[in-house]
């Protein structure tokens, strides 16, 4: 807590300018009017204040706005944002995307800090859903943002927002997250033609059910092995040899290199060996010819 001291004669700040960098902490506290600071926050960023001086300026704003800063101040916080705690930010009501962008810009190039996470959370909750423009902005600053959300949080993403998602935004998503995102993507891209649809939906296919994979095999998509390897194992297992062949097209030869890895390994174990042999890839481990295949799911349903 800075001790309350009177401002020396002639030092009272008339505006926020570079002369203030020569003020000691106690002088800033005594000579800068909080209301003036609030109206001229846009100037603070252009002045090379020390961290200690910024602490004083923050303190003045805290005193002026004990219930939380107004958006007009928040938008121009600049580097002062780095001084804010998550508790400070929880008091804010940020509704403007421009404000969000301005604050994210301050933190650009760094990991998502607790402050930024809190800011985003406040912003999204204020909007009620993660709309396209917001998602566009967030993924531009933090490509992994989408995958940092819980499946429950992702459920509030409207299908229209999916258009803003780039393949790299989904790199760190786990299957549970893709399970939520995939149906939204399918809805968002449903009116696109076959090849264009596949380009857009490809990154989301880790959440696709078997039926959709079978349907994709009808579209001449030639899925690459990297995409195939990210598919849900339980969705791949029921695919027939012919369906996998049609789904992968010329990339089917890549199955050989992946035969020891999931989901290819588990898929091979489900196929009849004579069906696998027809691929001519030397895949081994299928069900030997003449063996009976029991449908255990049917058995469980009956018991």
């Amino acid at each position: 807590e800075v001790e309350k001291t009177a401002c020396p004669s002639g030092k009272k700040a008339r505006e926020i300018d570079e002369s203030l960098i020569f003020y000691k902490k106690w002088e800033l506290e005594a000579c800068v009017d909080a209301a003036l600071l609030a109206t001229q926050m846009d100037r603070v960023n252009a002045i090379p204040f020390t961290y200690e001086q910024l602490d004083v300026l923050k303190h003045k704003l805290d005193e002026l706005y004990p219930q939380g800063y107004p958006e007009s101040v928040i938008q121009h916080l600049g580097y002062l944002f780095l001084k804010m705690s998550p508790e400070d930010i929880r008091k804010w009501n940020v509704t403007s995307l421009e404000t969000l962008k301005a604050l994210l810009e301050v933190n650009k190039g760094h990991e998502m800090s607790p402050q930024v996470a809190t800011l985003i959370d406040r912003f999204v909750k204020g909007r009620g859903q993660l709309d396209k423009d917001t998602l566009d902005t967030l993924t531009a600053f933090y490509p992994g943002y989408l995958c940092s959300l819980s499946p429950e949080e992702l459920s509030s993403v409207p299908p229209s927002s999916i258009w803003a998602v780039r393949p790299q935004d989904l790199d760190t998503c786990d299957p549970r997250q893709l399970d939520v995102l995939y149906p939204k993507a399918r809805l968002a891209f449903q009116n696109m033609n076959g090849s264009e649809y596949f380009v857009k939906i490809q990154s989301f296919l880790g959440g696709a059910p078997t039926e959709d994979l079978k349907a994709l095999s009808q579209q001449n998509v030639s899925m690459d092995l990297a995409t195939f390897m990210k598919l849900r194992t339980d969705a791949v297992l029921p695919l027939t040899v012919a369906e996998v062949q049609k789904l992968l097209g010329p990339h089917v030869e890549g199955l050989k290199a992946e035969e020891r890895h999931r989901p290819v390994r588990d898929w091979i174990l489900r196929q009849r060996q004579d069906d696998l042999d027809t691929l001519g890839l030397g895949l081994q481990g299928g069900i030997p010819n003449g063996y009976l295949v029991l449908d255990l799911s049917m058995q469980e349903a009956l018991s």
Epitope: P209, D212, A215, T240, D295
Partner: antibody, heavy 117, light 107 residues
Framework: EVQLVESGGGLVQPGGSLRLSCAAS????????MSWVRQAPGKGLEWVAT????????YYPDSVKGRFTISRDNSKNTLYLQMNSLRAEDTAVYYC??????????WGQGTLVTVSS | DIQMTQSPSSLSASVGDRVTITCRAS??????LNWYQQKPGKAPKLLIY???RLHSGVPSRFSGSGSGTDFTLTISSLQPEDFATYYC?????????FGQGTKVEIK
């Protein structure tokens, strides 16, 4: 052993409707896409409709689009073809076939549909 | 739509003959070409899929070859039970289309 048995064929007037059924056995019905293929008397084969294993996706050629509807009931292992606004050129033997990726690998014995006044 | 054209439309041959039927696609269909056999009053049966792969239970005298647009079905030594009509079908692109058929008759 895969078995497909069609039923529901018969004589119908132009503009009329008919519903064909196909009872499947010998395989896990809900794992496979299913199709209908027809053959006009003395003519070749023509694909009519395909439905995905869960019934979400359906595919038709232009010749029947909007008039025919393929559906399935996986709990009954049964495939259906609802045919409306029938025309004389729809007269054919209708075959139910299992569809695997790009292959009609097993076929039923067929049911004859005659459209005539 | 992809048109499938078979030739000849019909042929007469004797038991033991080598028979060749060709199928041409109006555009590239990769190797997604299947052959079916149909006997009078019966349903078609799958013989060969993906150009050259024999369906289960099909005798090895049947073989297939080709790629892209031109395909061939060969019966190395015709047997009495092989007299039937043969159809090719492309499975590359919707709508799935069949050739008009080739009838193999006894000479």
């Amino acid at each position: 052993e895969v078995q497909l048995v069609e039923s529901g064929g018969g004589l119908v007037q132009p503009g009329g409707s008919l519903r064909l059924s196909c009872a499947a056995s010998g395989f896990t019905f809900s794992d496979y896409f299913m199709s209908w293929v027809r053959q006009a008397p003395g003519k070749g084969l023509e694909w009519v409709a395909t439905i995905s294993n869960g019934g979400t996706y359906t595919y038709y050629p232009d010749s029947v689009k909007g008039r025919f509807t393929i559906s399935r009931d996986n709990s009954k292992n049964t495939l259906y073809l609802q045919m409306n606004s029938l025309r004389a050129e729809d007269t054919a033997v209708y075959y139910c076939a299992r569809f695997d990726g790009y292959i009609f690998d097993y076929w039923g014995q067929g049911t004859l549909v005659t459209v005539s006044s | 739509d992809i048109q499938m054209t078979q030739s000849p439309s019909s042929l007469s041959a004797s038991v033991g003959d080598r028979v060749t039927i060709t199928c041409r696609a109006s555009q590239d269909i990769s190797n997604y070409l299947n052959w079916y056999q149909q006997k009078p009053g019966k349903a078609p049966k799958l013989l060969i899929y993906y150009t050259s792969r024999l369906h289960s239970g099909v005798p090895s005298r049947f073989s297939g070859s080709g790629s892209g647009t031109d395909f061939t079905l060969t019966i190395s030594s015709l047997q009495p039970e092989d007299f039937a009509t043969y159809y090719c079908q492309q499975g590359n692109t919707l709508p799935w289309t069949f050739g008009q058929g080739t009838k193999v008759e006894i000479k």
